[in-house]
């Protein structure tokens, strides 16, 4: 470091250092002044600072603080933002795969159902995607709608392929009969349980990541109080007013000042810790039926089993539905 | 544990699933994220210290500035004197957080509550008997959570299938598939899906 300077009879060095922040010299006294108007850098004797300089220092100090805070959180912010994007895209890919698997299953095993089945499957997985992204959709309704839509097609194409066109207006009745007769056994309920549990967890996982981003963004853009600005000015700049151009703040003093400035922000700490630990617990539980990847990619198999179940009981069902959905009784299922 | 067979037999027709070597599943990626997040668990309490360590403070110098005067770095005055004539620091702390911070704390409390609710110890959740009316149905065995469905000729268990750097590809475009096709056999190949997602550090 340079040797300590002799006392400055003029304010020459203070003037030059102030120009780092503010071009021009009109705010800096030519020679030391009493400084009775100063509010932050309270002088013990004559000073080379003016009220205008103090104001500039305070403004700069608060901007410095904001930049320091932003640089402190940059790595954490990037970590959460990138992961939120990665997982959102990954979940969309899982949904797309699940849809393709299910469509492939229909194409391979029930080609006669495919045109309509593809449509219903597509609608179901669109709803799944929307639900994950926070849409206000009921999972049970989604599953019910899938099976309600599928059953009339299964009945008319697989169970009763020779059904005359005149009988095709019984769709509403078939939808009603599907639930009343538990046509697919407990498979719809099974799917509801698995899909709702796995999607709920997935949805809250994404919500939590997005809130994490919001937390960092909020603290990143905090405006520091005037009191904090005064403390920072005194710590970083007031030494200049005494001609001390090379000294740095004491470490302990810096900690005290920062704790004062950050008192509000530090209150987040308790809830932030809990957030990370709760998220960890959630992630540890995301397996089996709480893992959407596992559940959705296995749906094609469960749906296939549910159709086999219907086929196995086709004789019994056809008789019952023939009676229930005769024209005279059609209305009660509307 | 669950497995995903190389060949899925469905009504004697085969859906071949691409064999994937990559072990980076969604679940491993989630765990990796949590480990990284845990290194930031003290982020907010550590902020004052972090900022002091990234702003100029006297480390090797004999003298330092305490807000009022030049003092010896290890003297009592180094932390104390500078605070004397400043406004009341206790007062500053008593003001409490500003409204935006209070709001974000409320949101954190809410999400923490939701996360805790979701993470409750999980009991058995599926009915063992899939059909209450007595029609035949496959038995899911002891581990109902793992049973994705089964009937007649044996159930299929599913392993976490989507791998991060590999996509299971079928050689049919299901959206344009002709309705009367009797069989479509997926290829044993892989298509990279996550190439554009990069690694998160």
């Amino acid at each position: 470091q340079p040797p300590p300077p002799p006392p400055d009879a003029t304010c020459h060095q203070v003037r030059s250092f102030f120009q780092r922040l503010q071009p021009g010299l009109k705010w800096v006294p030519e020679t030391p002044v009493p400084g009775s108007d100063l509010q932050v850098c309270l002088p013990k004797g004559p000073t080379c600072c003016s009220r205008k300089m103090e104001e500039k220092y305070q403004l700069t100090a608060r901007l410095n603080m904001e930049q320091l805070l932003q640089s402190a959180s940059m790595e954490l912010k990037f970590l959460i933002i990138q992961n939120a994007a990665v997982f959102q895209e990954a979940f969309e890919i899982v949904v797309r795969h699940a849809k393709n698997y299910t469509n492939a299953m229909f194409k391979n095993n029930y080609p006669s159902l495919t045109p309509q089945a593809f449509e219903f499957v597509g609608e179901f997985f669109t709803d799944v995607s929307l639900y994950i992204l926070g849409s206000d959709i009921n999972v049970d309704d989604m599953v019910n709608e899938l099976f309600d839509s599928l059953f009339p097609v299964i009945y008319t194409q697989l169970m009763n392929p020779g059904l005359p066109d005149s009988a095709l207006d019984i769709n509403e009745c078939l939808r009603g009969a599907r639930r009343d007769l538990k046509v697919f056994g407990n498979f719809p309920k099974l799917i509801m349980t698995q899909v709702s549990k796995s999607l709920q967890v997935t949805r809250i996982f994404l919500q939590a990541l997005n809130l994490g981003i919001e937390v960092i963004n909020t603290t990143d853009h905090l405006k520091f109080s005037k009191d904090c600005g005064r403390m920072l000015t005194r710590m970083w700049y007031c030494s200049y007013c005494q001609g001390l151009m090379m000294v740095k703040p004491c470490g302990g003093y810096c900690n005290v000042v920062m704790q004062g400035c950050m008192a509000g922000v530090v209150e987040i700490d308790k809830y932030w810790r809990e957030y990370i630990l709760s998220l960890e617990e959630l992630v540890n539980g995301m397996y089996r039926i709480y893992d959407m990847e596992n559940v959705l990619l296995g749906l094609f198999s469960t749906i296939h089993d549910s159709i086999q179940y219907v086929q196995k009981n086709a004789g019994k069902l056809t008789t019952t539905i023939g009676k229930l959905c005769a024209h005279s009784q059609q209305r009660q299922y509307r | 544990s669950a497995y995903y067979p190389e060949d899925l037999f469905i009504d004697k027709k085969v859906l071949k699933v691409a064999h994937v070597e990559h072990e980076e599943t969604l679940s491993s990626r989630r765990r990796e994220l949590i480990q990284k997040l845990k290194s930031f668990i003290s982020f907010y309490s550590a902020l004052p210290g972090y900022i002091c360590s990234h702003s100029p403070v006297a480390e090797n110098d004999t003298l330092c500035w305490n807000g009022q005067e030049l003092v010896e770095r290890y003297s009592q005055k180094a932390a104390r004197n500078g605070m004397k004539n400043q406004f009341n620091l206790h007062e500053l702390k008593m003001k409490g957080p500003e409204p935006v911070v209070s709001q974000i704390i409320d949101k954190l409390k809410h999400i923490n509550q939701l996360l805790r609710t979701m993470s409750m110890p999980k009991g058995r959740v599926l009915d063992k008997n899939l059909d209450e009316e007595g029609f035949e149905s496959g038995d899911c065995g002891d581990d109902e959570d793992e049973c994705i469905g089964g009937s007649g000729d044996g159930m299929i268990k599913v392993k976490n299938q989507l791998r991060f750097l590999a996509e299971l590809a079928y050689d049919l475009d299901v959206d344009d598939a002709p309705g009367n096709s009797q069989q479509a056999t997926p290829k044993d190949n892989e298509i990279s899906t996550f190439h554009n997602l990069g690694n998160v550090h």
């Epitope: 922040l21 901007l63 640089s71 703040p249 | 100029p56």
Partner: nanobody
Framework: QVQLVESGGGLVQPGGSLRLSCAAS????????MSWVRQAPGKGLEWVSA????????NYVDSVKGRFTVSRDNSKNTLYLQMNRLRAEDTAVYYC?????????????WGQGTTVTVSS
């Protein structure tokens, strides 16, 4: 270990030119703003010039504007001060200093200085 080593000082006649260099190590040079500060014999410190990390932004004290040019080569981790039309009052020890993240605040690190003497 942060190190700043100045070189290029010497004796020069009024109106002459000199180019000072400062070799930096021990930190990420390209992301640090840098300054030149001088101390004339028997006088206090005077800030001379500053340059941003990328080199895109520069700043000078009024007394050297138009005569001195600050620059940097981030690939060589080196800071420069091109001094033209030198005057007797430019005689001083020139220090290069690493700016901290506190704009206009205390410098993080200083070099040991290089002496420039302007005399006929």
């Amino acid at each position: 270990q942060v190190q700043l080593v100045e070189s290029g000082g010497g004796l020069v006649q009024p109106g002459g030119s000199l180019r000072l260099s400062c070799a930096a190590s021990g930190f990420t040079f390209s992301s640090s703003a840098m300054s030149w500060v001088r101390q004339a014999p028997g006088k206090g410190l005077e800030w001379v010039s500053a340059i941003s990390g990328s080199g895109g932004s520069t700043n000078y004290v009024d007394s050297v504007k138009g005569r001195f040019t600050v620059s940097r080569d981030n690939s060589k981790n080196t800071l420069y001060l091109q001094m033209n039309r030198l005057r007797a009052e430019d005689t001083a020890v020139y220090y290069c200093a690493k700016e901290s993240m506190v704009r206009g605040g205390p410098f993080d690190y200083w070099g040991q200085g290089t002496t420039v003497t302007v005399s006929s």
